[in-house]
Interface confidence: low
């Protein structure tokens, strides 16, 4: 049975935190790091569906970013394997109504952190 901290939501052996506050992408990651987590890594279409359904109407940062002209990478450095399209020309990815899009890192949005759950 998944065990997630208070205010975190469990899904498929991960725990997710959906913020109420808004921050830029870098500050959002800093917050997640303080919770022993990262901005959310989305590893399957099922996970994406779950996050889209759960997050409500607001845009939320996730843990994908890229240098100009470079491929998308997750926080942990692994390359993104194109599980879903990311629209826009920004360097940081977020989830919106329809899926994933991108924006400049300094814009403020809500965010989603993720970490492995604890099995007890």
């Amino acid at each position: 049975q998944a065990a997630c901290p208070e205010s975190w939501i469990g899904f498929q052996r991960k725990c997710f935190y959906f913020s109420d506050d808004t921050k830029n992408w870098t500050s959002s990651q800093r917050f997640c790091d303080s919770q022993d987590a990262d901005l959310a890594q989305v590893e399957s279409f099922q996970e994406l569906n779950f996050l889209l359904r759960y997050k409500g109407p607001s845009d939320h940062w996730i843990g994908l970013s890229r240098e100009q002209g470079q491929p998308w990478k997750w926080i942990n450095g692994t390359e993104w394997t194109r599980q879903f399209p990311i629209l826009g020309a920004g360097e940081c990815a977020y989830l919106n109504d329809k899926g994933a899009s991108s924006a400049r890192h300094y814009t403020e949005r809500k965010w989603i952190c993720s970490k492995s759950d604890i099995h007890v």
Epitope: N49, R53, P57, D59, N96, D97
Partner: antibody
Amino acid sequence: QVQLVQSGAEVKKPGASVKVSCKASGYTFTGYYMHWVRQAPGQGLEWMGWINPNSGGTNYAQKFQGRVTMTRDTSISTAYMELSRLRSDDTAVYYCAFAQPGAETLNFDLWGRGTLVTVSS
Amino acid sequence: DVVMTQSPLSLPVSLGQPASISCRSNQSLVYSDGGTYLNWFQQRAGQSPRRLVYKVSNRDSGVPDRFSGSGSGTDFTLRISRVEAEDVGVYYCMQGTHWPYTFGQGTKLEIK
């Protein structure tokens, strides 16, 4: 308290358009999806689509694609549903309904009282 | 589109007696997040619909505990343990799992 107040009844001719409004109060308008559902006289309920008041993003049922437009004005916490090229079988009560974010995003928590739109020549 | 089929369409019940409404879908309503998005609504004459139950069995606040929802997959039931006069109206099931969201035809509950 939380409520949705809809515009008054309308009578339209076939081929015309109608725009129904839904004013929200008592909660953060941009924090909840707004759905539109209609009900023809003596008939059941039919979901038409939703608008995300935060972004303006919409999703429409295929049946209404090309004829329905959902918009919002966040400055007055109001959602709108415009239906064009009206036919007699569009005669119905049109409801707005909001849905809480979170795990229950696709549930309808609170409904407006409905707006009767009559299409008649 | 997912077809929701309710039965019976008309349900005459004596006061104080139990009532049961069935709702079947033509495909599973289990979503990829593991949730089953099946709601029940009550619509009294001349009023807007009111949600009674969400996600199969979760009763809304203010809904009397004589109402209960159950089921899984494609087969769902709304039960009223003891019908009261105020329960008269039309009851609809609605699925929010598949696009577009669809309602059953409605079951009219009346007092015998």
